[in-house]
């Protein structure tokens, strides 16, 4: 298949059509639950998602939703108390109308004449907005995750089925399959579909084999495929890297622990804006790259790549993606240079002709037996203590 084209402006919601047509799956999702198969029921109305009305929520609708989401049948259908007190009871006879426009706008209901999603209809403004919300817990609590890839948007593909996390076999695994995974997880689109051994092998069962998604499915379990067979081993666990995953490198320095900061995000390498590049950000990056701590933030060069990423860290995060970050999709960093960093594990610190040495005194552990003290910006001597 052709690989899915990355959108200009990322939209991490599923790529369903804007309006539900008969024959399509229900425009429903479950939120604030323990998995994608439990939670508050929301229905899509044109471009927005709205909580479904609890007053008209029944077992048929619950069953239909669970089936439509590939979550088996419904285990429990309930109503969630509204975030604000419910509206007063009907007004006494003779009172003037209290029906405010906001109230009349109302909440949508999912009304089903049977337990099959094709027999359901989304009815707008069916309930008063302040009423209870529909909730459901489905029997088959299915979920999906990416593990051991350094973030929630890259790694080995694992599905939760029958209470157990398991892998997906890499036979026929391609970008369309990975695209469904990425979109389902809110991780954008697939940058890479990886065969086994790119990530650590799994340990549990292998839930799926011969997965063959079109790329349009909302959930991985909607894709054609076979149950995991015995001839698939964990050395064949499928993996994915999604556009929202961030990975970093330092370029143009003496080694991998020094240079210009570059982040791979949404399919391309980007430089990082130095207007918000401070010691805390440099520290997090050096540590996450296994390069020790940050020794210096040298003056940056003009952006050689698209420079659109900003980070703001407190210094305790494990990776830059755990920091507060923003990616400006339309403008390059205004009046800024590309961030650079020198980490303590860089071999340029061993070199006596290092062009720049930090002005402040920093103590850096290079090896357990040697400590280097850098005293003076002018003096390029290293004193071994």
């Amino acid at each position: 298949h052709p690989s899915p084209a990355p959108p200009d402006q990322l939209n991490t919601s599923s790529a369903e059509s804007e309006l539900w047509e008969p024959g399509e799956r229900l425009p429903v999702r479950l939120t604030n639950g323990s998995s994608s198969c439990s939670g508050t029921v929301e229905v899509r109305l044109e471009a927005s998602w709205e909580p479904a009305c609890g007053a008209l929520w029944d077992s048929r609708a619950a069953e239909a939703v669970c089936r439509a989401l590939g979550c088996g049948g419904a285990e429990a259908a309930s109503q969630l108390a509204p975030p604000t007190p419910e509206l007063p009871p009907p007004p006494a006879a003779g009172n003037t109308s209290v029906a405010a426009n906001a109230t009349l706008a109302g909440a949508p209901a999912l009304l089903c004449s049977g337990a099959e999603w094709r027999l359901c209809e989304v009815v707008e403004h069916a309930c008063r907005s302040d009423g209870r919300r529909a909730r459901v817990t489905c029997a088959e609590n299915r979920a999906l995750r990416l593990v051991d890839g350094g973030g929630a948007c890259a790694g080995r593909v694992e599905m939760l089925e029958h209470g157990e996390w398991g892998s997906v076999c890499d036979d026929t695994w391609d970008l369309e399959d990975a695209h469904v995974v990425c979109r389902q997880l809110g991780c954008g689109w697939a940058v890479q579909a990886l065969p086994g051994l790119h990530f650590t092998p799994g340990r549990g069962p292998i839930h799926r084999d011969q997965v063959n998604c079109s790329g349009a499915e909302a959930y991985l379990w909607d894709c054609p495929g076979l149950p995991g067979q015995h001839y698939c081993g964990h050395k064949e666990d499928a993996g994915a890297v999604c556009s929202e995953h961030q990975s970093w490198r330092l370029t143009g320095g003496a080694d991998r622990c020094e240079g210009q900061v570059e982040v791979h995000f949404r399919g391309v390498w980007n430089t990082v804006c130095d207007s918000e590049w401070y010691p805390s950000e440099a520290k997090v990056l050096c540590q996450s790259l296994g390069c020790g701590t940050a020794v210096e933030r040298p003056k940056g060069l003009p952006h050689s790549l698209s420079g659109r990423m900003y980070y703001s860290c407190n210094g305790e995060e494990l990776t830059l993606s755990n920091c507060s970050w923003r990616f400006n999709n339309s403008n390059l960093c205004s009046q800024s240079l590309a961030a650079r960093v020198l980490c303590s594990a860089s071999r340029s610190l061993h070199n006596l002709s290092t062009p720049e040495v930090p002005a402040s005194v920093q103590t850096v552990t290079i090896e357990s037996s040697v400590t280097v003290k850098i005293e003076n910006k002018e003096s390029r001597e290293l004193m071994l203590l």
Epitope: A55, L56, P91, S97, A99, L104, A109, L111, R128
Partner: nanobody, 123 residues
Framework: QVQLVESGGGLVQPGGSLRLSCSAS????????MGWFRQAPGKEREFVAA????????YYADSVKGRFTISRDNSKNTLYLQMNSLRAEDTAVYYC????????????????WGKGTLVTVSS
């Protein structure tokens, strides 16, 4: 207390049409979502059609979809059910219902019931 009074029932031949009306005593008629239920002899009461407060949303039972049309006139405090292509199985007592919190699709949300009007479809 909202008083609901149905009218317009009667005997009609298969394939014929009838228009039921439901007049509400309440000046706050527009605060209520309205609907119709029916009960055939020896059967349980079943949902027919519902309409929200302002009339912008409607919902029908599968058995009447495309044949029946529910509407309301808030200025006249009146609910209507236009029934076309009537069949023998549409024979029942038709009840007008009013609901404060939600469209009256399920019986537990209904606040008020009318006394009913009989529709008989027979040749």
């Amino acid at each position: 207390q909202v008083q609901l009074v149905e009218s317009g029932g009667g005997l009609v031949q298969p394939g014929g049409s009838l228009r039921l009306s439901c007049s509400a005593s309440e000046r706050t008629f527009s605060d209520y979502a309205m609907g119709w239920f029916r009960q055939a002899p020896g059967k349980e009461r079943e949902f027919v059609a519902a309409i929200n407060w302002v009339g912008g949303s409607t919902y029908y039972a599968d058995s009447v979809k495309g044949r029946f049309t529910i509407s309301r006139d808030n200025s006249k405090n009146t609910l209507y059910l236009q029934m076309n292509s009537l069949r023998a199985e549409d024979t029942a007592v038709y009840y007008c219902v009013a609901s404060w919190g939600a469209m009256p699709v399920l019986t537990h949300v209904i606040n008020y019931w009318g006394k009913g009007t009989l529709v008989t479809v027979s040749s």
